[in-house]
């Protein structure tokens, strides 16, 4: 995943005190034996801090070295600070672990800013608030990397949760979430609940902080409310999606529908922004300004470089509206919608200079690689990686931030048309996914 | 605390080019712009340009477009401008600053001389 | 671009006395304002943006008012550490522009 301009995320405080839950509702689904249910032991599992990305606990090598690991949909590898690093508190010692092998093969990974480097390996890998197994996996061990950690950020490593196509340094390296599925029983599915703090943390506040939730192998009832809506997984590259239409407020923004997947459309945990293509962010920006003129924000502000502020409590949450992202559905000409409120793209932060006021940054930007349904939209919703049937889950998040008036929203079914029109296809070269 | 540290005074011989380091600590260095404003002795004040340290996007004012770069090193949380063809009227102290709502935040400048 | 023009461009004032600076903007820039002051050889300090709101730790003398195109900075009560050159900014829209200045001097 493009982690200079996509950088890593923002996370927040489990049930986030400014945001109201929602009262469970019926569950309409019909259960699927194994994959549903409680998994107490990895709930809360992730901890964060905002624009920085969301990590889980992970240890490697024996015995068992203990790294922070960030959650990145949009990649396919598992890669470690492996180096002394200024901006790394630890890093995995290979030559400590007896049960490193050394693969004897390097890898080099250029992002459209930065980059890292270093050597693969394979060793035994298990994530403590996970399934109670131990995997041996290919690591990259990265020596030498250009703006990739990020200072203060509390993660030393990186777990590619998409598939083999786009691992580095080709497919055959297989992925963890691939070795995990292969060497043990846990099916072969995740969910991620991502709980947006709808506030500023402090660096201490993050460290005692719940993030949200990895459910490894499952789904857990308790991270959602409503029914859970499924949308197919386009291609098993990144986890590409289609979306068919666009609602500001509910008013259409009437483009071509290929345009919101121009080159494509992704679901991306280690993006913060919602990013959409420049023809689309500009009709989105041009429909919210309209939306929320009653206030006149600084052009700034749209380009994600002027913070907005309002006195502590004051946020007029209403004048600013919905989002709404038509995605399509598993049954012909079948499509649902997922709504985002404010509250997911106004992203707070905690400016010194300001702190008397509750401070902002617009989290929807530009994008020349398609759509990154980021952790903008991700925070709104209990998201469900269903690889074994290629599909990908929508349902109200339980911990997303809200107020007394809206909430975000997951509903269907919709009539669309034609919405196999509505994906792009990418001319196919071999460098196709390099430097994205 | 927010500190913005700058490089320290040069003297430049017309045509030559200058290159001022503007060193961010105390914050998430790339959650916030950094911008660019010059001084001229005795004069106003004069905004030069922006660059998104996240991903290295710039904005110039169209005055400079030609003649200044900015660039972003994140490992050292260090933002570089460089003035090329130096005329003496580029004689200014530089300063860059950190957005938030509008610029909170100011280096200490540094005075660039252009002389032959 | 937005011209910022700032009056008077200097001022004679007394410890104690109420000061008032205005800045006029060539076009409407609703409340994306701020004020800054500089003092001789220093870079400027933040005082006011979003043309009323004080950053944190500028001290209550200083205010500032206005909307549109109509901006102005009060000093209640001048105190020897505000004699300095204070400048008004837009930055409501690209490029960023600020006024010339006002001196604010002793008496």
């Known amino acids: 995943t493009q982690h200079g301009i996509r950088l890593p995320l923002r996370s927040g405080l489990g049930g986030a005190p400014l945001g109201l839950r929602l009262p469970r509702e019926t569950d309409e689904e019909p259960e699927e034996p194994g994959r549903r249910g409680s998994f107490v032991e990895m709930v809360d599992n992730l901890r964060g801090k905002s624009g920085q990305g969301y990590y889980v606990e992970m240890t490697v090598g024996s015995p068992p070295q203990t790294l922070n690991i960030l959650v990145d949909t949009g990649s396919s590898n598992f890669a470690v600070g492996a180096a002394p690093h200024p901006f790394l508190h630890r890093y995995y010692q290979r030559q400590l672990s007896s049960t490193y092998r050394d693969l004897r093969k390097g890898v080099y990974v250029p992002y459209t800013q930065g980059k890292w480097e270093g050597e693969l390996g394979t060793d035994l890998v298990s994530i403590p608030h996970g399934p109670n197994v131990t995997v041996r996996a290919n690591i990259a061990a990265i020596t030498e990397s250009d703006k990739f950690f990020i200072n203060g950020s509390n993660w030393e490593g990186i777990l590619g949760l998409a598939y083999a196509e786009i691992a580095r340094p080709d497919d055959s390296l297989e992925p963890f979430f691939d070795s995990l599925v292969k060497q043990t029983h846990v099916p072969n599915l995740f969910s991620l609940q991502l709980c947006g703090a709808g506030f500023p943390l402090n660096q201490s506040e993050v460290l005692a902080s719940v993030g949200g939730s990895m459910i490894i192998g499952g789904i857990d009832h308790s991270l959602y409310t409503g029914s859970l809506w499924y949308t197919p997984i386009r291609r098993e590259w990144y986890y590409e999606v289609i979306i068919v239409r666009v609602e500001i407020n509910g008013q259409d923004l009437k483009m071509d529908c290929k345009e919101y997947n121009y080159d494509k459309s992704i679901v991306d945990s280690g993006t913060t922004n919602l990013r959409l293509p420049k023809k689309v962010f500009e009709a989105a920006v041009k429909s919210i300004k309209a939306a929320s003129s009653t206030e006149k924000f600084p052009d700034g502000f749209w380009l994600g470089e002027q913070l907005v502020c309002w006195q502590a409590g004051t946020t007029p949450w209403n004048i600013f509206p919905v989002i709404s992202l038509y995605l399509m559905g598993e049954v012909t000409n079948q499509s649902f919608r997922i709504t985002i409120l404010p509250q997911q793209y106004l992203r707070p932060v905690e400016d010194v200079a300001t702190s008397q006021d509750d401070c902002y940054k617009f989290a929807i930007s530009q994008s020349s690689t398609g759509t990154v349904m980021g952790a903008v939209i991700m925070e709104g919703f209990y998201v469900v990686f269903d690889r074994a049937r290629k599909r990908i889950g929508f349902a109200v998040s339980a911990c997303h931030v809200h107020d007394e008036f809206r909430t975000a929203a997951v509903e269907g079914p919709f009539v669309t048309l034609d919405m196999e029109d509505c994906g792009y296809n990418i001319p196919q070269t071999d460098e196709s996914t390099l430097m994205t | 605390q927010v500190q913005l540290v700058q490089s320290g005074a040069e003297v430049k011989k017309p045509g030559a080019s200058v290159k001022v380091s503007c060193k961010a600590s105390?914050?998430?260095?790339?959650?916030?712009?950094i911008h660019w404003v010059r001084q001229a002795p005795g004069q106003g004040l004069e905004w030069m340009g922006m660059?998104?340290?996240?991903?290295?996007?710039?904005k110039y004012n169209q005055k400079f477009k030609a003649r200044a770069t900015l660039t972003v090193d994140t490992s050292t949380s260090t933002v570089y401008m460089e003035l090329s063809s130096l005329r003496s009227e580029d004689t200014a102290v530089y300063y860059c600053a950190r957005s938030g709502v509008a610029f909170p935040y100011w280096g200490q400048g540094t005075l660039v001389t252009v002389s032959s | 671009d937005i011209q910022m023009t700032q009056s008077p461009s200097s001022l004679s004032a007394s410890v104690g006395d109420r000061v008032t600076i205005t800045c006029k903007a060539s076009q409407d820039v609703g409340r994306n304002v701020a004020w800054y002051q500089q003092k001789p050889g220093k870079s400027p300090k933040s005082l006011i943006y979003s043309a009323s709101h004080r950053y944190s730790g500028v001290p209550s003398r200083f205010s500032g008012s206005g909307s549109g195109t109509d901006f102005t900075l009060t000093i209640s009560s001048l105190q020897p550490e505000d004699f300095a050159t204070y400048f008004c900014?837009?930055?409501?829209?690209?490029?960023?522009?600020f006024g010339q200045g006002t001196k604010v001097e002793i008496k």
């Open positions: 900014q837009q930055y409501n829209s690209y490029p960023y522009t």
């Open positions: 660059i998104d340290p996240s991903d290295s996007y710039t």
């Open positions: 105390g914050y998430t260095f790339t959650n916030y712009w």
